[in-house]
C-alpha cells in the first residue's frame, strides 16, 4: 500500500505541485497497450522527475515510464488489466506522490477516422459514416460516439448526436439550405471499460443544397 497518512485530513497533503493525470490505450500497437501520464501544471520542472507503475502487472513488479518531452509514456503487453496499479512520481528512490488507478477506468480510445458525408437526393438526407480502429480490437470494442456538427459561421453552436454505430442520418430539413457545415466525431468507452473521450476526428466539410423554389426542395450539391 502507499505509505501516506491515513488521517482523512492529511491524505490529500501530497505535494499538489506534482498532481498528474493518466490515460491508457489498449491494443494501441498490435497487442501492446500504452499508458500516458502528464503533470497537471505545465510549469513543473520535470528535469529529475520519473514515473513508475507497480502492481497489477504480468511477470514484473514495476515498470518505468519513458519521458517524451513533457509527457511520460509506457508501451507494454504487461498490464494485467485487473486490479489497481500504483503510479508514482519519483525523484531517485523517493516517491513524491502516488495514485492507485485501475487502468480499465482511464481508457482513452483512438480517434475515429474516415469521416464522410453523402447527400441522398431521393431521401432528402445526409448519410454520415466514419470508421474506428476499435472494431478490430479485442478489449475496447464497444464505444459511444459523439458526432458534432455546426454551420461554419456559428462559431460555438455545435449540435451533438450520441450513437453506438458508425452511421448517422441527418435530415435535410433540419439543416439550413445553401450553407457550409463542419462535422467531426469522437468516441468514449462503453460497456465495462471507462475513461475519457478520444481526440476529435479531423473535421469534414459539406455544403447543403439550395432550395429549389418550384418544389420547395433543396437542389442537390
Amino acid at each position: 500500500e502507499s505509505g501516506y497518512a491515513q488521517n482523512g485530513d492529511l491524505e490529500d497533503a501530497e505535494l499538489d505541485d506534482y498532481s498528474f493525470s493518466c490515460y491508457s490505450q489498449l491494443e494501441v500497437n498490435g497487442s501492446q497497450h500504452s499508458l500516458t501520464c502528464a503533470f497537471e501544471d505545465p510549469d513543473v520542472n520535470i528535469t529529475n522527475l520519473e514515473f513508475e507503475i507497480c502492481g497489477a502487472l504480468v511477470e514484473v513488479k514495476c515498470l518505468n515510464f519513458r519521458k517524451l518531452q513533457e509527457i511520460y509514456f509506457i508501451e507494454t503487453k504487461k498490464f494485467l488489466l485487473i486490479g489497481k496499479s500504483n503510479i508514482c512520481v519519483k525523484v531517485g528512490e523517493k516517491s513524491l506522490t502516488c495514485k492507485k488507478i485501475d487502468l480499465t477506468t482511464i481508457v482513452k480510445p483512438e480517434a475515429p477516422f474516415d469521416l464522410s458525408v453523402v447527400y441522398r437526393e431521393g431521401a432528402n438526407d445526409f448519410v454520415v459514416t466514419f470508421n474506428t480502429s476499435h472494431l478490430q480490437k479485442k478489449y475496447v470494442k464497444v464505444l459511444m460516439h459523439d458526432v458534432a456538427y455546426r454551420q461554419e459561421k456559428d462559431e460555438n453552436k455545435w449540435t451533438h448526436v450520441n450513437l453506438s454505430s458508425t452511421k448517422l442520418t441527418l435530415l435535410q430539413r433540419k439543416l439550413q439550405p445553401a450553407a457550409m457545415y463542419e462535422i467531426k466525431v469522437r468516441s468514449i468507452p462503453d460497456h465495462y471499460f471507462k475513461g475519457f473521450w478520444s481526440e476529435w476526428s479531423p473535421s469534414y466539410y459539406f455544403r447543403t443544397p439550395e432550395i429549389n423554389n418550384s418544389s420547395g426542395e433543396m437542389d442537390p450539391i
Epitope: 500500500e1 502507499s2 491524505e11 488489466l81 489497481k84 492507485k100 478489449y139 465495462y192
Partner: antibody, heavy 118, light 111 residues
C-alpha cells in the same frame, strides 16, 4: 494492517431503518471503493452496492434502489450503509468489503448482524 | 442479472486428494483475455476470503494449492492437495455486469 471494522449487531422492527458503519484503516481511504454484501441465514452472498470515497459516487443493486443509501466520511475513514423500510427478509449479516479491482473484494469487515422482527 | 450456477452443491474429499468446483454463468463474463470471475472461501462464522481473482490470479497470501481456470461461461476452482483446514463454503462471483452476482456456494468437507 488493512482492516475494516463494522458497528455492532442491531435488532429492528419491520418498517424501521438501520444504519451500519464500516471504519477503514491501514491504507489510504480514498484509494479503494467500498461495497456492501449481505448474507441471509444459511444463504449465499448478495451484492447491495458500493461507494467511491474519493468522489462520493455510488452504485446500487437495482433490487435495493430507493431503500439503500451509502455515504462516506473522509475525516473518519468511515462508510455507512442505511437500509430503510426493513422487512423480515432483510434479516442477514451485512458485510462491508473493499474492492481490490473491478469489482472483486479483497478485504472484508467482520460482519454486522441485523435482525428484523416484530 | 447474470446467474452463476455452482456444482456440485457439496463435496467430500479425502486429505491429499483433489477437489474441483465448477461455476457456470448464464452469459459470458470474459472480454478477450480478461476473465471477470473470482472465487472466495468462507468458513463458519467468518467473512468470505478472496482466493482467486480474474479467474486465475492467486490472491496474495493464499496457498498455491488453490488454482483457478476457465473463460467465457465455464470456470473451475481446484484445490490440490486438499488439507483439513479447507473445510468451508466456496463461492464464485462475476464482475462484468452490475449487479455483481455470486454463485449459490459449494460446501467442501474433508473426509
Amino acid at each position: 494492517q488493512v482492516q475494516l471494522v463494522q458497528s455492532g449487531a442491531e435488532v429492528k422492527k419491520p418498517g424501521a431503518s438501520v444504519k451500519v458503519s464500516c471504519k477503514a484503516s491501514g491504507y489510504r481511504f480514498t484509494d479503494y471503493e467500498l461495497h456492501w454484501v449481505r448474507q441471509a441465514p444459511g444463504q449465499g452472498l448478495e451484492w447491495m452496492g458500493g461507494i467511491d470515497p474519493k468522489t462520493g459516487g455510488t452504485a446500487y443493486n437495482q433490487k435495493f434502489k430507493g431503500r439503500v443509501t451509502m455515504t462516506s466520511d473522509r475525516s473518519t475513514s468511515t462508510v455507512y450503509m442505511e437500509l430503510s423500510s426493513l422487512r423480515s427478509e432483510d434479516t442477514a449479516v451485512y458485510y462491508c468489503a473493499r474492492s481490490g479491482g473491478r469489482w472483486y473484494f479483497d478485504v472484508w469487515g467482520q460482519g454486522t448482524t441485523v435482525t428484523v422482527s416484530s | 442479472d447474470i446467474v452463476l450456477t455452482q456444482s456440485p452443491a457439496s463435496l467430500a474429499v479425502s486429505p491429499g486428494q483433489r477437489a474441483t468446483i465448477t461455476c457456470r454463468t448464464s452469459e459470458s463474463v470474459s472480454i478477450h483475455l480478461l476473465h471477470l470471475m473470482h472465487w472466495y472461501q468462507q468458513k463458519p462464522g467468518q467473512p468470505p476470503k478472496l482466493l482467486i481473482y480474474g479467474a486465475s490470479n492467486l490472491e496474495s497470501g493464499v496457498p498455491a494449492r488453490f488454482s483457478g481456470s476457465g473463460s467465457e461461461t465455464d470456470f473451475t476452482l481446484t484445490i490440490n492437495p486438499v488439507e483439513a483446514e479447507d473445510t468451508a463454503n466456496y463461492y464464485c462471483q462475476q464482475s462484468i455486469k452490475d449487479p455483481y452476482t455470486f454463485g449459490g456456494g459449494t460446501k467442501v468437507e474433508i473426509k
